[in-house]
């Protein structure tokens, strides 16, 4: 069977890395397990992996924006950053605004590795499934 | 054969949703067929599904920005909006603006499943074939 | 073996089209040769290509950004820009700005095409591995 | 910058036909609509109908169908309203005006044409 | 068809006092994602010109003393601080369906 993910997002986030919606709506999940905000990786391979974060705020300040996609394994002391996105200057000053950050890249991925989103202000993050999702399919 | 498909912009379009230009240029169809500004499933399966927008205008006035992928099928009573990206307060007031919207995921498509892109204003968008396009692949 | 390749920003790239690290960190080459900035295709078929580019700078002065990806063939006199994304008015003038530019799709590719990925501003792209990247697989 | 540059006034007999053009300039005239709007003398404001020069498409308000032609020159990106067997309550300011296609609103506006009506 | 319905036809008000204009639509003119109502200022002799759209956004080069508010079949449409180059006729107008229509205007005047 494939192995395939996609989350959506999950409004009762609190806490980073962001956790997902893994089992209603437009959710996918097969051959791949998640676990407290993350994807578990069970066979090693090449994988596609994906994030997009819809962040919006009701007065624009410009406070700068971050969404990683990076990668935990017991093996490795510390986290690998694979992909990133920073927004600064994005808005006009008081006014409502809306952006989207999108990352998609492959990688060759090992049994029990982890991968996790991570934004850089909760707050203004939008858990729309359609909107702010993380997903990954083995080529 | 692999079922593809890789759309690009046709300018002359007044409709919604947007139509796509699918015979000249770089364009791929296989195993897909295109109706009417839809893709066409023939075949239940993962696919990625993708598409670029390319949002411009003379003189900003930052009207809000939508780009939607969506679903229809005759089983369901309402369109299910698979991914989208919105956009406010992205450019300074009277300037020349250019912008472009990404989206791209995995999803469970079904036999029949019609697949169409949507934006919220027509009068923006830029239609060359690199920079507004439409695609998607059988995993 | 599959035909994969995932490329990382290079600082010392001086002119386009980009350089990219091929050897170390998250990098990917396996079916697909590189060669002075570019990725040869050494068996035609089905391609999803893609590639960020982050843009930055200390203040912002709303210069236009753009980001292709294209593809040349001794066969052909021109290069065919394959994936664009361009901005304009993205920043407040005078500030410290940071935006991303991510472009992804499908294409028939052909054996001793070369590909390459080109930006209008040299000096304002940030070549973190994270953040700036080409890649493609073979479907 | 955006303009909409419109014929000058017309005096016309009951069942005659007039056609007022407006002239583009400063934009893409094929990527918006140009809309059609009259307005009595101390009256409000009426749509008549939109043209789409991309493609010539185009669609009337009920109360012009028939009378009222839409029709556009891309080569001089140019308007044309065209309205026939002509009437005493016809005798009105007519607008030409840039329309977002999907939006709808009239963000730029012509210097409007004065058509009477009279015997 | 929407009817638009203007109130009042007339309103005086002395210049720096707020002004309040409504719209009412005979059925309701949003979606999910936007509110399909604009509103325009014209003076006499020259053409409307757009303030806001889709009901609550200001057009380029229009004062931030211009704000329009409201969602399904009631609009609202305030100038915070009345200036004397703002006493004029101001119309709403959806675009819903067709056809567009127009309110029948509301003429601001000097009290």
């Known amino acids: 069977l494939r192995k395939v993910a996609h989350l959506t997002g999950k409004s009762n986030s609190r806490s980073m890395p962001l956790e997902w919606e893994d089992t209603y709506g437009i959710v996918l999940l097969s051959g791949v397990k998640y676990k407290k905000g993350g994807l578990v990786i069970n066979e090693t391979g090449l994988y596609f992996v994906y994030s997009k974060v819809y962040f919006r705020g009701q007065s624009c300040n410009n406070l700068p924006l971050s969404h990683k996609v990076y990668m935990r394994n017991s093996k490795y002391p510390q986290d690998l950053v694979m992909m990133e996105g920073k927004m600064m200057s994005y808005c006009t000053t008081g006014q409502m605004w809306a952006r989207s950050s999108y990352l998609g890249a492959v990688f060759n991925l090992t049994s029990a590795d982890h991968l996790y989103v991570n934004v850089s202000e909760l707050s203004l993050v939008n858990f729309e499934e359609s909107q702010t999702f993380f997903g990954l399919y083995k080529l | 054969l692999r079922k593809v498909a890789h759309l690009t912009g046709k300018s002359n379009s007044r409709s919604m949703p947007l139509e796509w230009e699918d015979t000249y240029g770089i364009v791929l169809l296989s195993g897909v067929k295109y109706k009417k500004g839809g893709l066409v499933i023939n075949e239940t399966g993962l696919y990625f599904v993708y598409s670029k927008v390319y949002f411009r205008g003379q003189s900003c006035n930052n009207l809000p920005l939508s780009h939607k992928v969506y679903m229809r099928n005759s089983k369901y009573p309402q369109d299910l909006v698979m991914m989208e990206g919105k956009m406010m307060s992205y450019c300074t007031t009277g300037q020349m603006w250019a912008r472009s919207s990404y989206l791209g995921a995995v999803f469970n498509l079904t036999s029949a499943d019609h697949l169409y892109v949507n934006v919220s204003e027509l009068s923006l968008v830029n239609f060359e074939e690199s920079q507004t396009f439409f695609g998607l692949y059988k995993l | 073996l599959r035909k994969v390749a995932h490329l990382t920003g290079k600082s010392n790239s001086r002119s386009m089209p980009l350089e990219w690290e091929d050897t170390y960190g998250i990098v990917l080459l396996s079916g697909v040769k590189y060669k002075k900035g570019g990725l040869v295709i050494n068996e035609t078929g089905l391609y999803f290509v893609y590639s960020k580019v982050y843009f930055r700078g200390q203040s912002c002065n709303n210069l236009p950004l753009s980001h292709k990806v294209y593809m040349r063939n001794s066969k052909y006199p021109q290069d065919l820009v394959m994936m664009e994304g361009k901005m304009m008015s993205y920043c407040t003038t005078g500030q410290m700005w940071a935006r991303s530019s991510y472009l992804g799709a499908v294409f028939n590719l052909t054996s001793a095409d070369h590909l390459y990925v080109n930006v209008s501003e040299l000096s304002l792209v940030n070549f973190e591995e994270s953040q700036t990247f080409f890649g493609l697989y073979k479907l | 910058q955006v303009q909409l540059v419109q014929s000058g006034a017309e005096v016309k007999k009951p069942g005659s036909s007039v056609k007022v053009s407006c002239k583009a300039s400063?934009?893409?005239?094929?990527?918006?609509?140009i809309s059609w709007v009259r307005q009595a003398p101390g009256q409000g404001l009426e749509w008549m109908g939109w043209?789409?020069?991309?493609?010539?498409?185009?669609q009337y308000n009920e109360n012009f169908k028939g009378r009222a032609t839409l029709t556009t020159d891309k080569s001089t990106s140019t308007a044309y309203m065209e309205l026939s067997s002509l009437r005493s309550e016809d005798t009105a300011v007519y607008f030409c005006?840039?329309?977002?296609?999907?939006?709808?609103?009239?963000?730029?506006w012509g210097q409007g044409t004065l058509v009477t009506v009279s015997s | 068809e929407i009817v638009m319905t203007q109130s009042p036809a007339t309103l005086s008000v002395s210049p720096g006092e707020r002004a309040t204009l409504s719209c009412r639509a005979s059925?309701?003119?949003?979606?999910?994602?936007?509110?399909?109502i604009h509103w325009y200022q014209q003076k006499p002799g020259q053409a409307p010109r757009l303030l806001i759209y889709?009901?609550?956004h200001l057009e380029s080069g229009i004062p931030a003393r211009f704000s329009g508010s409201g969602s399904g079949t009631e609009f609202t449409l305030t100038i915070s601080s009345l200036q004397s180059e703002d006493f004029a006729v101001y119309y709403c107008?959806?675009?819903?369906?067709?056809?567009?229509?127009f309110g029948q205007g509301t003429k601001v005047e000097i009290k």
């Open positions: 005006a840039r329309s977002l296609i999907s939006t709808a609103m009239f963000d730029h």
């Open positions: 107008q959806h675009s819903r369906e067709l056809p567009r229509t």
């Open positions: 400063g934009y893409t005239f094929t990527r918006f609509d």
């Open positions: 889709l009901a609550s």
């Open positions: 059925k309701s003119v949003s979606t999910s994602d936007f509110s399909y």
């Open positions: 043209i789409f020069p991309g493609d010539g498409s185009s």
